[in-house]
Interface confidence: low
C-alpha cells in the first residue's frame, strides 16, 4: 500500500541502490518515487552533517522485505516511496530554495528580475533541470539578478552549497508548464542522430517515448521495431539528446520509428506508467514471485500490488495452468524495462501500474491499523 | 480572497469552481475534488438552489475568463448535503458532490488528500485559503484563482472573537490578528489546505467570517477531520467503495 | 455591481391591486433572504414582508398580512409584492433588500434598491 | 412583535459636535441591532450592523454599542454630510426599525 509518513531523526542503514543530491526530503522522495528500484530512502539536510560531501544527501535504498533497520541520526529525514500512491505520484516539484546553491553546468546566464522569472526561464528552456539565481543582495554586485540555466548527467544537481542570498529551484516542465510545447507526431520508418543517453527494450514506441519523457536526458528517442533486420537491437529504445536540443539529423530507415520527448506539453503529460497488455510476447526478468491468478488483468493487479514488481508474463501454456488459473510471473530488473523480449509465446506480459496515478488504492495518510 | 496573489497552472489542482446556469452562468462557490467522481464544499453553496441540473463544476482551470461555451464542465449526479446542516446557522457546513462522470487526474485536476479522522495532534503552519472570490467586501469575482497564506488560531482565540456565535470544535478559524488576508464572497466552499511533512491536506471549508479581512475577525472553516466519517459512510454507501483520497 | 431594480408602482384605487417587481443583478439572488421596506411619506421605514432563500418560508408584517404576498423566481433573480385590497395608508416609497442571515456567510451583504412610488388615492 | 424606541425624533447639532443617539428594544434582541443613514429621496445605508461592526467603506467617527435593549450610535465629530435621519433596526426575530432621529443643523 501507500505509505507517506516521514522519520524524523532517522536514517535506512543498508539497501543503496543509488545516491544523489536533492535539497530536500519530498524532492528525494519524489527521485525514490520513479526510480525503477527505489522503495525507501534517506536523506541529510545540511545541518545534520559535517561532512560536507554528505550534505544534502539523497540515498535511494531497496530492500527485498519492502523494509530496512532504521538508525538514530540527528537531522536525517527518512521515508517510503510513493510508487504505489496514486495521484501523489507527480514529478513536478514547485518549491524554490533559499540560500542555496545547486551546482551543474551552467548553459546560460541572463539578467532576470526575479527567482520567479528564473523558474520560467527553465522551465522554457529546452535543456534546463534547475537553475539557480542571484539576488539583488548578492555580495558580488556583478552576478546580481543573474539567473543561471543548469543540466546534470542524471537531472540532479552535481552539488548543493548553502549560499546566502541565492535561490535555486528546478525546472517546471514535469508540471506541463513549459511553454515550448512538444511534438506527439511518431515518425514511421526514421531513425534519429545524436547522443544515446541510454538504451532500455520496450514492446512498442509508445512505451519509448514515455520512458524518455521522464528520462531527465532525453529529448528525443528511436526504437527498433521486434521484425528490426540486426536481432540483437529489436525492441530496443535509444534514448537521445543533442546541443540543440533537436536532432542533428535523421535517417530514413525502415522499421525504426522516432519521436520526442512529450516534457515540453502545455497542459498535459502522459502518465508514467504502462498499461497495455501485449498478448503473445513474454517479458524477460528477475523472478519475484509466481502466483496462480485466473486471468491477465489479475495478474497485471497483482503486480501492481507488489511493490518490487515492475512488469509481468502471464502464461497460458497447459502445464502454467491449474483449472482457471494459470501462472503469473512477476518480475524486475534494474532499470525497470524487460531484459528481453521474446514473441510468439502463450502468454501475455505488461508492465506495472504501480506509478499510475489515477488509482483509487492510493491514501493520503499514514496506514492506521483496526485494533 | 482578500490581500492574496495570482496561482500558477497546477499549483491547486483540486480546486473546482461552482457555477450555476440560469439565464445567465456565473461562479458562486469554490470546492475541492477529493476522489474521480466526488467534490467537497460547504452545504450553504446550495442555499436556496438544490435543483442539480443548473450546476456546472469547472476542474483543471485557472481563469474564469478562460470558459467559454466549449469548456468541459462536469455535472453533478447527487448533492449530498450535512443532515444537521441549518440554513440559519454556521454549524455542519459541509456537503458533497457526487459527479455524473469520473474525471481522469492530470497535473491540474488532481484530488486533495483529506485529514485523518479527528485530527488534533497535528500543528499546521503553512496553511493556504484560494479561491475565485471577492478581493474586498464590497467586490467582486476575480477572473484569477487567487491564493493566501493564512496562519490558523485557537478556537478559544476565535471564540473571543465571536461572542455572539458558537465556535464548535467542528469548526477551524485561520485569520491575522491585524486582517488584510482572508477568504471573502465567492471563496465558500473552497479549500482550506494546509502542508505537513511534503504533503498538502484539506484542514477547511471556506465557510463564514464578519465581513472580510477585518481587524480581529478570523475566518471560519468547517474542520473536514471532524466529518471523516460521514464522508466516508457517503461515498462509500453511494458508490460501495470509498473513491476519495482519505486514510486506509 | 450588485444592484437592485424596483418597479411596478403608480397610482391605484383603494381596494385595487398592484404588482411590484424587484429585478437583482450581481449577485447570486438565490441565495439570500429578500424582503420589502416601505416609507410612507415624511415617516419612518416600516419593514413590510421577508422570503427565505427557497422561497418556501414567507413572513409579514401585521398591517399587511392577509393582503400582501412576497414571492421569488430564483430563475429569473426576481422577488415581487402582490398586494390587494390596497388602502390609503398603503401610500409609500417601497424598497426591495436583502441582508444576511443567521452567521455572516462568505456570501452574505447588505444591499438596498431606489424603490418604487406606490399612492393609493381616489 | 418587538418594538424599536429611539430617541431624540430630532436633534440638532453643529459640525464638529459628538452626538449620541439611543434606540431601545421591548425585549432583548442580543446583538442583533443595525444602524441605517438615509438622506432625502435616497435609499437607507448600512452603517454599523451587530450592535458595533462598522461595515466596510463606513468613515471610522460612527461607533455603535450595547447588547441586549439598550444601544447606542455615536458620531465623535459630525460632519456636513453626517446631516441625515438615523434608523436602528432588529434582526434577532424578523424586522423592525425604530421611528428614526433627524439630525439637523443647529
Known amino acids: 500500500g501507500c505509505l507517506t509518513q516521514l522519520y524524523e531523526n532517522a536514517f535506512f542503514r543498508g539497501g543503496d541502490v543509488a545516491s544523489m543530491y536533492t535539497p530536500n526530503a519530498q524532492y528525494c522522495q519524489m527521485r525514490c518515487t520513479f526510480h525503477p528500484r527505489c522503495l525507501l530512502f534517506s536523506f541529510l539536510p545540511a545541518s545534520s552533517i559535517n561532512d560536507m560531501e554528505k550534505r544534502f544527501g539523497c540515498f535511494l535504498k531497496d530492500s527485498v522485505t519492502g523494509t530496512l533497520p532504521k538508525v538514530h541520526r540527528t537531522g536525517a529525514v527518512s521515508g517510503h516511496s510513493l510508487k504505489q500512491c496514486g495521484h501523489q505520484i507527480s514529478a513536478c516539484h514547485r518549491d524554490i530554495y533559499k540560500g542555496v546553491d545547486m551546482r551543474g553546468v551552467n548553459f546560460n546566464v541572463s539578467k532576470v528580475s526575479s527567482v520567479e522569472e528564473c523558474q520560467k526561464r527553465c522551465t522554457s528552456n529546452i535543456r534546463c533541470q534547475f537553475f539557480s539565481y542571484a539576488t539583488q543582495t548578492f555580495h558580488k554586485a556583478e552576478y546580481r539578478n543573474n539567473c543561471l540555466l543548469k543540466y546534470s548527467p542524471g537531472g540532479t544537481p552535481t552539488a548543493i552549497k548553502v549560499l546566502s542570498n541565492v535561490e535555486s529551484g528546478f525546472s517546471l516542465k514535469p508540471c506541463a508548464l513549459s511553454e515550448i510545447g512538444c511534438h506527439m507526431n511518431i515518425f514511421q520508418h526514421l531513425a534519429f542522430s545524436d547522443v544515446d543517453v541510454a538504451r532500455v527494450l520496450t514492446p512498442d514506441a509508445f512505451v519509448c517515448r514515455t520512458i524518455c519523457t521522464y528520462h531527465p536526458n532525453c529529448l528525443f528517442f528511436t526504437f527498433y521495431t521486434n521484425v528490426w533486420k540486426i536481432e540483437s537491437q529489436r525492441n530496443v529504445c535509444l534514448l537521445k539528446t543533442s546541443e540543440s536540443g533537436t536532432p542533428s539529423s535523421s535517417t530514413p530507415q525502415e522499421n525504426t520509428i522516432s519521436g520526442y520527448s512529450l516534457l515540453t506539453c502545455k497542459r498535459t503529460l502522459p502518465e508514467p506508467c504502462h498499461s497495455k497488455i501485449y498478448p503473445g510476447v513474454d517479458f524477460g526478468g528477475e523472478e519475484l514471485n509466481v502466483t496462480f491468478v485466473k486471468g491477465v488483468n489479475v495478474c497485471q493487479e497483482t503486480c501492481t500490488k507488489m511493490i518490487r514488481c515492475q512488469f509481468f508474463t502471464y502464461s497460458l501454456l497447459p502445464e502454467d495452468c491449474k483449472e482457471e488459473k494459470c501462472k503469473c510471473f512477476l518480475r524486475l530488473s534494474m532499470d525497470g524495462s524487460p531484459t528481453r523480449i521474446a514473441y510468439g509465446t502463450q502468454g501475455s506480459s505488461g508492465y506495472s501500474l504501480r506509478l499510475c496515478n489515477t488509482g483509487d488504492n492510493s491514501v493520503c495518510t499514514t496506514k492506521t491499523s483496526t485494533r | 480572497i482578500v490581500g492574496g496573489t495570482n496561482s500558477s497552472w497546477g499549483e491547486w489542482p483540486w480546486q473546482v469552481s461552482l457555477q450555476v446556469k440560469l439565464t445567465a452562468q456565473r461562479h458562486l462557490c469554490g470546492g475541492s475534488l477529493i476522489g474521480h467522481q466526488w467534490v467537497l464544499t460547504a452545504a450553504h453553496c446550495f442555499d436556496g438552489l438544490p435543483l442539480q441540473d443548473v450546476w456546472r463544476i469547472y476542474s483543471g482551470i485557472l481563469n474564469l475568463s478562460d470558459i467559454t461555451k466549449d469548456t468541459p464542465f462536469s455535472q453533478i449526479k447527487e448533492i449530498i448535503i450535512h443532515q444537521n446542516y441549518k440554513v440559519s446557522e454556521g454549524n455542519h457546513d459541509i456537503a458533497l458532490i457526487k459527479l455524473q462522470a469520473p474525471l481522469n487526474y492530470t497535473e491540474f485536476q488532481k484530488p486533495i488528500c483529506l485529514p485523518s479522522k479527528g485530527d488534533t495532534s497535528t500543528i499546521y503552519t503553512n496553511c493556504w485559503v484560494t479561491g475565485w472570490g471577492f478581493s474586498k467586501e464590497k467586490g467582486e469575482i476575480q477572473n484569477i484563482l487567487q491564493k493566501v497564506n493564512i496562519p490558523l488560531v485557537t478556537n478559544e482565540e476565535c471564540q473571543k472573537r465571536y461572542q455572539d456565535y458558537k465556535i464548535t470544535q467542528r469548526m477551524v478559524c485561520a485569520g491575522y490578528k491585524e486582517g488584510g488576508k482572508d477568504a471573502c464572497k465567492g471563496d465558500s466552499g473552497g479549500p482550506l489546505v494546509c502542508k505537513h511533512n511534503g504533503m498538502w491536506r484539506l484542514v477547511g471549508i471556506t465557510s463564514w467570517g464578519e465581513g472580510c479581512a477585518r481587524r480581529e475577525q478570523p475566518g471560519v472553516y468547517t474542520k473536514v477531520a471532524e466529518y471523516m466519517d460521514w464522508i466516508l459512510e457517503k461515498t462509500q454507501s453511494s458508490d460501495g467503495k470509498a473513491q476519495m483520497q482519505s486514510p486506509a | 455591481e450588485v444592484q437592485l431594480l424596483e418597479s411596478g408602482g403608480g397610482l391605484v384605487q383603494p381596494g385595487g391591486s398592484l404588482r411590484l417587481s424587484c429585478a437583482a443583478s450581481g449577485f447570486t439572488f438565490s441565495h439570500y433572504i429578500m424582503m420589502w421596506v416601505r416609507q410612507a411619506p415624511g415617516k419612518g421605514l416600516e419593514w413590510v414582508s421577508g422570503i427565505y432563500s427557497s422561497g418556501g418560508i414567507t413572513v409579514y408584517a401585521d398591517s399587511v398580512k392577509g393582503r400582501f404576498t412576497i414571492s421569488r423566481d430564483n430563475s429569473k433573480n426576481t422577488l415581487y409584492l402582490q398586494m390587494n385590497s390596497l388602502r390609503a395608508e398603503d401610500t409609500a416609497v417601497y424598497y426591495c433588500?436583502?441582508?444576511?442571515?443567521?452567521?455572516?456567510?462568505?456570501?452574505?451583504?447588505?444591499?438596498w434598491g431606489q424603490g418604487t412610488m406606490v399612492t393609493v388615492s381616489s | 412583535d418587538i418594538q424599536m424606541t429611539q430617541s431624540p425624533s430630532t436633534l440638532s447639532a453643529s459640525v464638529g459636535d459628538r452626538v449620541t443617539i439611543t434606540c431601545r428594544a421591548s425585549q432583548s434582541i442580543s446583538s442583533w441591532l443595525a444602524w441605517y443613514q438615509q438622506k432625502p429621496g435616497k435609499a437607507p445605508n448600512l452603517l454599523i450592523y451587530?450592535?458595533?461592526t462598522l461595515e466596510s467603506g463606513v468613515p471610522s467617527r460612527f461607533s455603535g454599542s450595547g447588547s441586549g435593549t439598550e444601544f447606542t450610535l455615536t458620531i465623535s465629530s459630525l460632519q456636513p454630510d453626517d446631516f441625515a435621519t438615523y434608523y436602528c433596526?432588529?434582526?434577532?426575530?424578523?424586522?423592525?426599525f425604530g421611528q428614526g432621529t433627524k439630525v439637523e443643523i443647529k
Open positions: 433588500a436583502y441582508r444576511r442571515i443567521g452567521v455572516p456567510r462568505r456570501d452574505s451583504f447588505d444591499i
Open positions: 451587530k450592535a458595533s
Open positions: 433596526q432588529q434582526y434577532n426575530t424578523y424586522w423592525t
